[in-house]
């Protein structure tokens, strides 16, 4: 297994293997509808 920053969910995207599901600690809003960062 190659190790990437994102820790789950492989997806072939533009012929490149990338991780899809991201850690809940991600600050990018990978989880649909989950409030992230300091936004109020």
């Amino acid at each position: 297994d190659a190790e990437f920053r994102h820790d789950s969910g492989y997806e072939v995207h533009h012929q490149k293997l990338v991780f899809f599901a991201e850690d809940v600690g991600s600050n990018k809003g990978a989880i649909i509808g989950l409030m992230v960062g300091g936004v109020v």
Epitope: D7, S8, G33, V36
Partner: antibody, heavy 112, light 111 residues
Framework: QVQLVQSGAEVKEPGASVKVSCKGS????????VHWLRQLPEKGLEWIGR????????IYTPKFQDKATLTVDTSTDTAYMELSSLRSEDTAVYYC?????WGQGTLVTVSS | DIVMTQSPLSNPVTPGEPASISCRSS???????????LYWYLQKPGQSPQLLIY???NLASGVPDRFSSSGSGTDFTLKISRVEAEDVGVYYC????????FGQGTKVEIK
């Protein structure tokens, strides 16, 4: 008030294209991924894809790879989803989502 | 695609009583990192959906603690300890182990 405001309902003929906008109000849209989903009439939710406004990187569900194009204009805090080659089966309410905020939904009706 | 299957599709409930919704995935959502990539959303009538539960058992901000979720790798349950009138709507389970897919929805209505 922080919110995502989507453009209004659209009626299109089969084969046409439509571009739906999603503007961040009191919200810096470039900070977080923008997800797009759709809800077919009386049906469940389908994830179309997402865009990272920081670098324009996109990921699509395979069935939408040739149907949807996601873009962001960071200068106006607006995300866009363009749908091409519309068919009656594309009639749905389309939602944008970023962080904990959802747009109100845009009804796209495809009818001749 | 990972297929998410919910039951029942309709669930008439009595206010003050408990209620539960089941969801099954066609593939285990438990990753080797110990996280389970299962989510619950609620769409109230006339509203956009909202996130209730993320990564199987974490309550989203502002969600009342009468909601809870549990499960294994493929079988999951959303429980409402005491249903309130404001809980009516369509509940969806979803996964993002591989992209995002949603269940067909369970409509919860007051008896």
């Amino acid at each position: 008030q922080v919110q995502l405001v989507q453009s209004g309902a659209e009626v299109k003929e089969p084969g046409a294209s439509v571009k739906v906008s999603c503007k961040g109000s009191g919200f810096n849209i470039k900070t977080y991924y923008v997800h797009w989903l759709r809800q077919l009439p009386e049906k469940g939710l389908e994830w179309i894809g997402r865009i990272d406004p920081e670098n324009g990187e996109t990921i699509y569900t395979p069935k939408f790879q040739d149907k949807a194009t996601l873009t962001v204009d960071t200068s106006t805090d607006t995300a866009y989803m363009e749908l091409s080659s519309l068919r009656s089966e594309d009639t749905a309410v389309y939602y944008c989502v970023s962080s904990g905020y959802w747009g109100q939904g845009t009804l796209v009706t495809v009818s001749s | 695609d990972i297929v998410m299957t919910q039951s029942p599709l309709s669930n008439p409930v009595t206010p003050g009583e408990p209620a539960s919704i089941s969801c099954r995935s066609s593939k285990s959502l438990l990753h080797r990192n110990g996280k389970t990539y299962l989510y619950w959303y609620l769409q109230k009538p006339g509203q956009s959906p909202q996130l209730l539960i993320y990564q199987m058992d974490n309550l989203a901000s502002g969600v009342p603690d009468r909601f809870s979720s549990s499960g294994s790798g493929t079988d999951f349950t959303l429980k409402i300890s005491r249903v309130e009138a404001e809980d009516v709507g369509v509940y969806y389970c979803a996964q993002n182990l591989e992209l995002w897919t949603f269940g067909q929805g369970t409509k919860v209505e007051i008896k």
